[in-house]
Protein backbone atom coordinates (compact mmCIF):
# COMPACT_ATOMS: atom_id res chain seq x y z
CA UNK A 1 0.00 0.00 0.00
CA UNK A 2 1.43 3.38 -0.96
CA UNK A 3 -0.14 6.60 0.28
CA UNK A 4 0.95 9.85 -1.28
CA UNK A 5 0.14 13.40 -0.29
CA UNK A 6 -0.06 16.56 -2.32
CA UNK A 7 2.86 18.91 -2.34
CA UNK A 8 1.05 22.25 -2.35
CA UNK A 9 0.84 22.96 1.37
CA UNK A 10 -2.71 22.86 2.77
CA UNK A 11 -4.08 22.13 -0.73
CA UNK A 12 -3.19 18.47 -0.62
CA UNK A 13 -5.23 15.31 -1.00
CA UNK A 14 -4.47 11.71 -0.13
CA UNK A 15 -3.89 9.34 -3.03
CA UNK A 16 -3.50 5.61 -2.36
CA UNK A 17 -2.11 2.94 -4.67
CA UNK A 18 -1.57 -0.79 -4.25
CA UNK A 19 1.35 -2.58 -5.87
CA UNK A 20 0.04 -5.22 -8.24
CA UNK A 21 0.92 -7.75 -10.90
CA UNK A 22 -0.34 -8.24 -14.43
CA UNK A 23 -0.84 -11.57 -16.19
CA UNK A 24 0.50 -11.18 -19.72
CA UNK A 25 -2.11 -11.55 -22.43
CA UNK A 26 -4.92 -10.58 -20.08
CA UNK A 27 -6.47 -7.43 -18.59
CA UNK A 28 -4.65 -5.76 -15.74
CA UNK A 29 -5.80 -3.28 -13.09
CA UNK A 30 -3.57 -0.54 -11.69
CA UNK A 31 -5.29 0.42 -8.43
CA UNK A 32 -5.54 4.03 -7.25
CA UNK A 33 -8.01 5.77 -4.96
CA UNK A 34 -8.29 9.37 -3.78
CA UNK A 35 -10.40 11.67 -1.60
CA UNK A 36 -13.53 12.16 -3.71
CA UNK A 37 -14.84 15.47 -5.02
CA UNK A 38 -18.49 16.39 -5.39
CA UNK A 39 -18.08 17.59 -8.98
CA UNK A 40 -16.83 15.20 -11.69
CA UNK A 41 -15.84 18.14 -13.89
CA UNK A 42 -13.32 19.26 -11.23
CA UNK A 43 -11.42 15.95 -11.20
CA UNK A 44 -8.30 15.33 -13.28
CA UNK A 45 -6.63 11.89 -13.32
CA UNK A 46 -3.23 11.43 -14.91
CA UNK A 47 -1.40 8.13 -15.12
CA UNK A 48 2.30 8.32 -15.94
CA UNK A 49 4.99 5.69 -16.33
CA UNK A 50 8.64 6.16 -15.46
CA UNK A 51 10.72 6.29 -18.63
CA UNK A 52 7.74 6.90 -20.93
CA UNK A 53 7.49 10.32 -22.55
CA UNK A 54 3.75 10.53 -23.15
CA UNK A 55 0.95 9.94 -20.68
CA UNK A 56 -0.39 6.49 -19.95
CA UNK A 57 -3.90 7.92 -19.57
CA UNK A 58 -5.65 11.18 -18.76
CA UNK A 59 -9.24 11.73 -17.63
CA UNK A 60 -10.59 15.23 -17.12
CA UNK A 61 -13.87 17.16 -17.28
CA UNK A 62 -15.72 13.88 -17.06
CA UNK A 63 -14.12 12.20 -20.06
CA UNK A 64 -10.92 10.69 -21.45
CA UNK A 65 -8.39 13.15 -22.83
CA UNK A 66 -5.91 11.17 -24.90
CA UNK A 67 -4.11 13.82 -26.96
CA UNK A 68 -0.92 13.35 -24.90
CA UNK A 69 -1.19 9.56 -24.62
CA UNK A 70 1.92 7.57 -25.43
CA UNK A 71 1.66 5.35 -28.50
CA UNK A 72 2.40 2.16 -26.53
CA UNK A 73 -0.82 2.62 -24.54
CA UNK A 74 -3.10 3.68 -27.41
CA UNK A 75 -6.39 1.80 -27.27
CA UNK A 76 -5.26 -0.20 -24.24
CA UNK A 77 -6.40 1.88 -21.27
CA UNK A 78 -9.60 3.05 -19.60
CA UNK A 79 -10.63 4.38 -16.21
CA UNK A 80 -13.86 3.27 -14.56
CA UNK A 81 -15.65 6.50 -15.49
CA UNK A 82 -18.73 5.88 -13.35
CA UNK A 83 -16.56 5.32 -10.27
CA UNK A 84 -14.33 8.40 -10.54
CA UNK A 85 -16.84 10.51 -8.61
CA UNK A 86 -16.46 8.20 -5.57
CA UNK A 87 -12.66 8.39 -5.65
CA UNK A 88 -11.68 5.45 -7.85
CA UNK A 89 -8.92 6.37 -10.31
CA UNK A 90 -7.91 2.78 -11.09
CA UNK A 91 -6.78 2.04 -14.61
CA UNK A 92 -7.78 -0.93 -16.75
CA UNK A 93 -4.95 -2.08 -19.01
CA UNK A 94 -5.63 -4.28 -22.02
CA UNK A 95 -3.41 -7.16 -23.14
CA UNK A 96 -0.68 -6.80 -20.51
CA UNK A 97 2.84 -7.20 -21.93
CA UNK A 98 6.15 -7.86 -20.18
CA UNK A 99 7.20 -4.34 -21.17
CA UNK A 100 4.34 -2.85 -19.12
CA UNK A 101 6.27 -3.59 -15.92
CA UNK A 102 7.65 -0.58 -14.10
CA UNK A 103 6.86 2.37 -11.84
CA UNK A 104 3.59 4.19 -12.49
CA UNK A 105 2.38 7.43 -10.95
CA UNK A 106 -1.29 8.14 -10.23
CA UNK A 107 -1.61 11.94 -10.16
CA UNK A 108 -4.89 13.54 -9.06
CA UNK A 109 -6.19 17.11 -9.13
CA UNK A 110 -9.52 18.04 -7.53
CA UNK A 111 -11.07 21.25 -6.21
CA UNK A 112 -9.58 20.28 -2.80
CA UNK A 113 -6.01 20.11 -4.07
CA UNK A 114 -3.46 17.80 -5.67
CA UNK A 115 -1.88 14.49 -4.75
CA UNK A 116 0.01 11.57 -6.22
CA UNK A 117 1.30 8.12 -5.38
CA UNK A 118 3.59 5.66 -7.10
CA UNK A 119 2.78 2.06 -7.93
CA UNK A 120 5.15 -0.79 -8.74
CA UNK A 121 3.67 -2.96 -11.46
CA UNK A 122 5.12 -6.39 -12.12
CA UNK A 123 4.29 -8.46 -15.16
CA UNK A 124 4.58 -12.17 -15.78
CA UNK A 125 2.41 -15.22 -16.19
CA UNK A 126 0.69 -17.28 -13.55
CA UNK A 127 -2.05 -19.88 -13.63
CA UNK A 128 -3.89 -22.31 -11.42
CA UNK A 129 -2.35 -25.78 -11.09
CA UNK A 130 -4.40 -28.94 -11.44
CA UNK A 131 -3.33 -32.11 -9.66
CA UNK A 132 -4.49 -35.48 -10.94
CA UNK A 133 -3.75 -39.13 -10.31
CA UNK A 134 -1.62 -40.46 -13.17
CA UNK A 135 -3.17 -43.83 -13.91
CA UNK A 136 -0.71 -44.49 -16.75
CA UNK A 137 2.21 -44.75 -14.35
CA UNK A 138 3.42 -48.09 -12.99
CA UNK A 139 3.19 -46.95 -9.35
CA UNK A 140 0.83 -44.51 -7.58
CA UNK A 141 1.77 -41.19 -9.13
CA UNK A 142 0.43 -37.63 -9.01
CA UNK A 143 0.74 -35.17 -11.88
CA UNK A 144 0.59 -31.42 -11.28
CA UNK A 145 0.09 -29.20 -14.36
CA UNK A 146 -0.15 -25.44 -14.76
CA UNK A 147 -0.43 -24.02 -18.30
CA UNK A 148 1.29 -20.61 -18.10
CA UNK A 149 4.10 -19.31 -15.89
CA UNK A 150 6.83 -16.68 -16.31
CA UNK A 151 9.48 -16.19 -15.02
CA UNK A 152 10.33 -19.84 -14.36
CA UNK A 153 8.87 -20.81 -11.00
CA UNK A 154 9.95 -23.23 -8.31
CA UNK A 155 7.80 -26.29 -7.63
CA UNK A 156 7.62 -27.90 -4.18
CA UNK A 157 5.52 -30.87 -3.09
CA UNK A 158 4.18 -31.26 0.44
CA UNK A 159 1.94 -33.74 2.23
CA UNK A 160 -0.37 -33.53 5.22
CA UNK A 161 0.80 -36.83 6.70
CA UNK A 162 4.54 -36.32 6.13
CA UNK A 163 4.79 -32.68 7.14
CA UNK A 164 8.24 -31.22 6.57
CA UNK A 165 9.27 -34.10 4.30
CA UNK A 166 11.48 -33.31 1.31
CA UNK A 167 9.93 -34.76 -1.85
CA UNK A 168 12.61 -33.56 -4.29
CA UNK A 169 14.07 -37.08 -4.59
CA UNK A 170 10.70 -38.61 -5.52
CA UNK A 171 9.46 -35.87 -7.86
CA UNK A 172 10.36 -34.67 -11.32
CA UNK A 173 9.56 -31.20 -12.69
CA UNK A 174 9.75 -30.02 -16.27
CA UNK A 175 9.14 -26.67 -17.98
CA UNK A 176 7.87 -26.66 -21.55
CA UNK A 177 7.97 -23.42 -23.55
CA UNK A 178 4.56 -22.44 -24.90
CA UNK A 179 3.96 -21.55 -28.54
CA UNK A 180 4.45 -17.80 -28.04
CA UNK A 181 8.00 -18.46 -26.72
CA UNK A 182 7.55 -16.52 -23.49
CA UNK A 183 5.47 -18.44 -20.99
CA UNK A 184 6.03 -22.03 -19.98
CA UNK A 185 3.87 -24.98 -19.06
CA UNK A 186 4.80 -26.47 -15.69
CA UNK A 187 4.53 -30.23 -15.20
CA UNK A 188 5.60 -31.91 -11.98
CA UNK A 189 5.23 -35.59 -11.20
CA UNK A 190 5.29 -37.05 -7.67
CA UNK A 191 6.02 -40.78 -7.32
CA UNK A 192 5.25 -43.36 -4.61
CA UNK A 193 2.23 -41.59 -3.18
CA UNK A 194 0.21 -43.23 -0.42
CA UNK A 195 -3.55 -43.43 -0.14
CA UNK A 196 -5.55 -41.51 2.53
CA UNK A 197 -3.27 -38.52 2.33
CA UNK A 198 -3.50 -34.92 1.05
CA UNK A 199 -0.72 -33.74 -1.26
CA UNK A 200 0.01 -30.15 -2.27
CA UNK A 201 1.84 -28.96 -5.37
CA UNK A 202 3.14 -25.42 -4.73
CA UNK A 203 4.28 -23.29 -7.67
CA UNK A 204 5.88 -19.93 -6.99
CA UNK A 205 7.78 -17.13 -8.73
CA UNK A 206 8.34 -13.52 -7.67
CA UNK A 207 4.87 -12.54 -8.89
CA UNK A 208 2.51 -15.26 -7.71
CA UNK A 209 2.17 -18.35 -5.60
CA UNK A 210 -0.29 -21.10 -6.53
CA UNK A 211 -1.22 -24.32 -4.78
CA UNK A 212 -3.02 -27.37 -6.05
CA UNK A 213 -4.22 -29.85 -3.42
CA UNK A 214 -5.41 -33.40 -3.95
CA UNK A 215 -6.84 -35.75 -1.34
CA UNK A 216 -6.83 -39.39 -2.37
CA UNK A 217 -8.88 -41.93 -0.42
CA UNK A 218 -10.13 -45.40 -1.36
CA UNK A 219 -13.55 -44.03 -2.27
CA UNK A 220 -12.94 -40.56 -3.70
CA UNK A 221 -10.56 -37.90 -4.96
CA UNK A 222 -10.95 -34.28 -3.83
CA UNK A 223 -9.16 -31.36 -5.48
CA UNK A 224 -8.68 -27.71 -4.57
CA UNK A 225 -6.64 -24.92 -6.14
CA UNK A 226 -5.61 -21.51 -4.89
CA UNK A 227 -3.64 -18.62 -6.41
CA UNK A 228 -2.23 -15.61 -4.59
CA UNK A 229 -0.44 -12.58 -6.03
CA UNK A 230 2.70 -11.59 -4.17
CA UNK A 231 2.36 -7.81 -4.02
CA UNK A 232 5.55 -5.94 -3.23
CA UNK A 233 5.74 -3.86 -0.07
CA UNK A 234 5.31 -0.09 0.05
CA UNK A 235 8.46 1.85 -0.71
Amino acid sequence: LIIGFGISGRHSITVTTVASAGNIGEDGILSCTFEPDIKLSDIVIQWLKEGVLGLVHEFKEGKDELSEQDEMFRGRTAVFADQVIVGNASLRLKNVQLTDAGTYKCYIITSKGKGNANLEYKTGAFSMPEVNVDYNASSETLRCEAPRWFPQPTVVWASQVDQGANFSEVSNTSFELNSENVTMKVVSVLYNVTINNTYSCMIENDIAKATGDIKVTESEIKRRSHLQLLNSKAS
Epitope: G25, D64, S67, Q69, G75, R76, R92, E180, T183
Partner: antibody, heavy 121, light 107 residues
Framework: EVQLVQSGAEVKKPGASVKVSCKAS????????IGWVRQAPGQGLEWIGD????????NYNEKFKGRATLTADTSTSTAYLELSSLRSEDTAVYYC??????????????WGQGTLVTVSS | DIQMTQSPSSLSASVGDRVTITCKAS??????VAWYQQKPGKAPKLLIY???TLQPGVPSRFSGSGSGRDYTLTISSLQPEDFATYYC?????????FGQGTKVEIK
Protein backbone atom coordinates in the same frame (compact mmCIF):
# COMPACT_ATOMS: atom_id res chain seq x y z
CA GLU B 1 -29.89 2.87 -26.28
CA VAL B 2 -26.81 2.77 -28.52
CA GLN B 3 -27.73 3.27 -32.17
CA LEU B 4 -25.61 3.41 -35.31
CA VAL B 5 -27.44 4.50 -38.47
CA GLN B 6 -25.62 4.17 -41.77
CA SER B 7 -26.13 5.95 -45.10
CA GLY B 8 -27.98 4.31 -47.98
CA ALA B 9 -26.83 1.96 -50.72
CA GLU B 10 -24.38 3.22 -53.35
CA VAL B 11 -23.59 2.18 -56.91
CA LYS B 12 -20.15 3.22 -58.16
CA LYS B 13 -17.99 2.74 -61.23
CA PRO B 14 -14.55 1.13 -61.05
CA GLY B 15 -11.88 3.70 -60.14
CA ALA B 16 -14.34 5.95 -58.30
CA SER B 17 -14.53 6.62 -54.55
CA VAL B 18 -17.32 6.08 -52.06
CA LYS B 19 -17.95 7.66 -48.67
CA VAL B 20 -20.17 5.79 -46.20
CA SER B 21 -21.45 7.55 -43.07
CA CYS B 22 -22.38 6.17 -39.66
CA LYS B 23 -24.34 8.41 -37.27
CA ALA B 24 -24.06 7.45 -33.61
CA SER B 25 -26.49 8.18 -30.79
CA UNK B 26 -27.24 6.99 -27.25
CA UNK B 27 -23.67 7.30 -25.93
CA UNK B 28 -20.72 9.72 -25.78
CA UNK B 29 -19.40 9.57 -29.34
CA UNK B 30 -15.90 10.83 -28.52
CA UNK B 31 -15.31 8.18 -25.84
CA UNK B 32 -15.54 4.97 -27.90
CA UNK B 33 -13.66 3.58 -30.86
CA ILE B 34 -15.68 2.89 -34.01
CA GLY B 35 -14.70 0.02 -36.28
CA TRP B 36 -15.51 -0.75 -39.90
CA VAL B 37 -16.10 -4.25 -41.27
CA ARG B 38 -17.13 -5.41 -44.72
CA GLN B 39 -18.79 -8.52 -46.10
CA ALA B 40 -18.70 -9.43 -49.77
CA PRO B 41 -21.72 -11.38 -51.11
CA GLY B 42 -21.69 -14.92 -49.68
CA GLN B 43 -18.36 -14.28 -47.92
CA GLY B 44 -17.14 -13.78 -44.36
CA LEU B 45 -16.48 -10.67 -42.29
CA GLU B 46 -13.36 -8.62 -42.99
CA TRP B 47 -12.00 -6.00 -40.60
CA ILE B 48 -11.08 -2.73 -42.35
CA GLY B 49 -9.96 -0.56 -39.45
CA ASP B 50 -11.11 1.63 -36.56
CA UNK B 51 -11.01 5.22 -35.34
CA UNK B 52 -11.11 6.94 -31.96
CA UNK B 53 -13.26 10.05 -32.55
CA UNK B 54 -11.94 11.69 -29.35
CA UNK B 55 -8.54 12.12 -30.97
CA UNK B 56 -8.81 10.96 -34.57
CA UNK B 57 -6.45 8.01 -33.95
CA UNK B 58 -6.79 5.24 -36.52
CA ASN B 59 -5.75 1.63 -37.12
CA TYR B 60 -5.99 0.00 -40.55
CA ASN B 61 -5.89 -3.50 -41.95
CA GLU B 62 -2.73 -3.57 -44.12
CA LYS B 63 -4.89 -4.64 -47.07
CA PHE B 64 -6.76 -1.31 -47.01
CA LYS B 65 -3.92 1.06 -46.11
CA GLY B 66 -3.73 3.93 -48.60
CA ARG B 67 -7.16 3.17 -50.03
CA ALA B 68 -9.40 3.46 -46.97
CA THR B 69 -9.66 6.65 -44.93
CA LEU B 70 -11.49 6.77 -41.61
CA THR B 71 -12.65 10.11 -40.26
CA ALA B 72 -15.08 11.38 -37.61
CA ASP B 73 -17.07 14.57 -37.19
CA THR B 74 -17.59 15.08 -33.44
CA SER B 75 -20.06 17.94 -33.98
CA THR B 76 -22.54 15.57 -35.64
CA SER B 77 -21.41 12.31 -33.94
CA THR B 78 -20.79 10.80 -37.35
CA ALA B 79 -18.00 8.46 -38.48
CA TYR B 80 -17.05 8.09 -42.14
CA LEU B 81 -15.36 5.46 -44.26
CA GLU B 82 -14.01 6.58 -47.61
CA LEU B 83 -12.75 3.93 -50.02
CA SER B 84 -10.97 5.03 -53.18
CA SER B 85 -9.88 3.36 -56.44
CA LEU B 86 -12.88 1.05 -56.29
CA ARG B 87 -12.83 -2.29 -58.08
CA SER B 88 -15.49 -4.95 -58.58
CA GLU B 89 -14.21 -7.00 -55.63
CA ASP B 90 -15.05 -4.08 -53.31
CA THR B 91 -18.73 -4.87 -53.83
CA ALA B 92 -19.88 -5.64 -50.30
CA VAL B 93 -22.00 -4.64 -47.35
CA TYR B 94 -20.02 -2.20 -45.19
CA TYR B 95 -20.77 -2.13 -41.46
CA CYS B 96 -19.76 0.32 -38.77
CA UNK B 97 -19.64 -0.94 -35.19
CA UNK B 98 -18.89 0.55 -31.80
CA UNK B 99 -16.02 -1.03 -29.89
CA UNK B 100 -16.84 -1.87 -26.28
CA UNK B 101 -14.64 -0.58 -23.46
CA UNK B 102 -14.56 3.19 -23.97
CA UNK B 103 -10.99 4.36 -24.78
CA UNK B 104 -9.96 0.71 -24.40
CA UNK B 105 -10.39 -1.03 -27.78
CA UNK B 106 -12.75 -3.90 -27.02
CA UNK B 107 -14.92 -6.20 -29.11
CA UNK B 108 -17.56 -4.72 -31.44
CA UNK B 109 -20.75 -4.71 -29.39
CA UNK B 110 -23.20 -2.52 -31.35
CA TRP B 111 -23.53 -2.53 -35.13
CA GLY B 112 -25.02 -0.35 -37.85
CA GLN B 113 -27.52 -1.86 -40.29
CA GLY B 114 -24.95 -2.02 -43.09
CA THR B 115 -24.51 -0.16 -46.38
CA LEU B 116 -24.41 -2.04 -49.67
CA VAL B 117 -21.77 -0.67 -52.04
CA THR B 118 -21.94 -2.05 -55.57
CA VAL B 119 -19.04 -1.48 -57.93
CA SER B 120 -20.03 -2.07 -61.53
CA SER B 121 -19.17 -0.63 -64.94
CA ASP C 1 -0.61 -10.09 -38.46
CA ILE C 2 -2.52 -12.74 -36.55
CA GLN C 3 -4.79 -14.97 -38.61
CA MET C 4 -7.73 -16.86 -37.11
CA THR C 5 -8.40 -20.29 -38.62
CA GLN C 6 -11.96 -21.37 -37.92
CA SER C 7 -13.31 -24.89 -38.24
CA PRO C 8 -15.43 -26.47 -39.48
CA SER C 9 -16.54 -24.17 -42.29
CA SER C 10 -20.02 -25.69 -42.07
CA LEU C 11 -21.84 -28.32 -40.06
CA SER C 12 -25.25 -29.98 -40.03
CA ALA C 13 -26.95 -30.53 -36.68
CA SER C 14 -30.33 -31.20 -35.15
CA VAL C 15 -32.26 -29.31 -32.50
CA GLY C 16 -30.95 -30.40 -29.09
CA ASP C 17 -27.48 -31.27 -30.37
CA ARG C 18 -24.29 -30.05 -28.70
CA VAL C 19 -22.29 -28.00 -31.20
CA THR C 20 -18.62 -27.02 -30.97
CA ILE C 21 -16.82 -24.52 -33.20
CA THR C 22 -13.09 -23.85 -32.89
CA CYS C 23 -10.73 -21.03 -33.80
CA LYS C 24 -6.95 -21.27 -33.84
CA ALA C 25 -4.76 -18.16 -33.74
CA SER C 26 -1.68 -18.23 -35.99
CA UNK C 27 0.55 -16.85 -33.23
CA UNK C 28 0.72 -15.27 -29.81
CA UNK C 29 -1.67 -15.69 -26.96
CA UNK C 30 -4.24 -13.52 -25.25
CA UNK C 31 -7.77 -13.80 -23.98
CA UNK C 32 -9.19 -11.33 -26.48
CA VAL C 33 -11.40 -13.61 -28.55
CA ALA C 34 -15.05 -12.78 -29.24
CA TRP C 35 -17.78 -14.80 -30.95
CA TYR C 36 -20.53 -13.45 -33.21
CA GLN C 37 -23.74 -14.88 -34.64
CA GLN C 38 -24.98 -13.64 -38.01
CA LYS C 39 -28.25 -14.39 -39.76
CA PRO C 40 -28.84 -13.71 -43.49
CA GLY C 41 -29.33 -10.02 -44.28
CA LYS C 42 -28.59 -8.96 -40.69
CA ALA C 43 -25.64 -7.40 -38.90
CA PRO C 44 -23.52 -9.68 -36.67
CA LYS C 45 -24.51 -10.01 -33.01
CA LEU C 46 -21.96 -10.25 -30.20
CA LEU C 47 -22.38 -13.43 -28.14
CA ILE C 48 -19.17 -13.80 -26.13
CA TYR C 49 -16.11 -11.64 -25.49
CA UNK C 50 -12.83 -12.02 -23.55
CA UNK C 51 -12.87 -15.76 -24.36
CA UNK C 52 -15.74 -16.72 -22.07
CA THR C 53 -17.79 -13.70 -20.95
CA LEU C 54 -21.41 -13.89 -22.08
CA GLN C 55 -22.84 -10.67 -23.53
CA PRO C 56 -25.95 -9.58 -21.53
CA GLY C 57 -29.14 -11.05 -23.00
CA VAL C 58 -27.40 -13.99 -24.66
CA PRO C 59 -28.79 -17.40 -23.61
CA SER C 60 -26.62 -19.48 -21.26
CA ARG C 61 -26.54 -22.40 -23.72
CA PHE C 62 -23.76 -20.42 -25.45
CA SER C 63 -20.34 -20.68 -23.81
CA GLY C 64 -16.76 -19.91 -24.75
CA SER C 65 -13.47 -21.35 -23.59
CA GLY C 66 -9.84 -21.53 -24.59
CA SER C 67 -6.34 -20.28 -23.97
CA GLY C 68 -3.07 -19.88 -25.82
CA ARG C 69 -3.89 -20.26 -29.51
CA ASP C 70 -7.04 -22.44 -29.29
CA TYR C 71 -10.55 -21.13 -28.62
CA THR C 72 -13.97 -22.78 -28.66
CA LEU C 73 -17.61 -21.74 -28.91
CA THR C 74 -20.06 -24.33 -27.59
CA ILE C 75 -23.82 -24.41 -27.96
CA SER C 76 -24.95 -26.93 -25.35
CA SER C 77 -28.38 -27.65 -26.83
CA LEU C 78 -29.05 -26.25 -30.29
CA GLN C 79 -32.33 -24.35 -30.66
CA PRO C 80 -34.20 -23.55 -33.93
CA GLU C 81 -33.14 -19.87 -33.70
CA ASP C 82 -29.44 -20.86 -33.47
CA PHE C 83 -29.15 -21.89 -37.13
CA ALA C 84 -26.88 -19.14 -38.43
CA THR C 85 -23.24 -18.39 -39.28
CA TYR C 86 -20.76 -17.92 -36.43
CA TYR C 87 -17.52 -15.94 -36.50
CA CYS C 88 -14.64 -15.61 -34.05
CA UNK C 89 -12.78 -12.32 -33.70
CA UNK C 90 -9.28 -11.73 -32.33
CA UNK C 91 -9.16 -8.22 -30.85
CA UNK C 92 -6.12 -8.32 -28.57
CA UNK C 93 -3.65 -6.88 -31.03
CA UNK C 94 -3.45 -3.62 -32.94
CA UNK C 95 -4.93 -5.31 -36.00
CA UNK C 96 -8.19 -7.19 -35.50
CA UNK C 97 -8.98 -10.39 -37.43
CA PHE C 98 -12.08 -12.52 -38.00
CA GLY C 99 -12.21 -16.25 -38.56
CA GLN C 100 -13.66 -17.44 -41.89
CA GLY C 101 -17.00 -18.37 -40.34
CA THR C 102 -18.94 -21.57 -39.58
CA LYS C 103 -22.39 -22.09 -41.06
CA VAL C 104 -24.63 -24.15 -38.77
CA GLU C 105 -27.35 -25.80 -40.86
CA ILE C 106 -30.35 -28.01 -40.07
CA LYS C 107 -29.66 -31.71 -40.56
Amino acid sequence: EVQLVQSGAEVKKPGASVKVSCKASGYTFTSYWIGWVRQAPGQGLEWIGDIYPGGGYTNYNEKFKGRATLTADTSTSTAYLELSSLRSEDTAVYYCARLDGSSYRGAMDSWGQGTLVTVSS
Amino acid sequence: DIQMTQSPSSLSASVGDRVTITCKASQGFNKYVAWYQQKPGKAPKLLIYYTSTLQPGVPSRFSGSGSGRDYTLTISSLQPEDFATYYCLQYGNLLYAFGQGTKVEIK
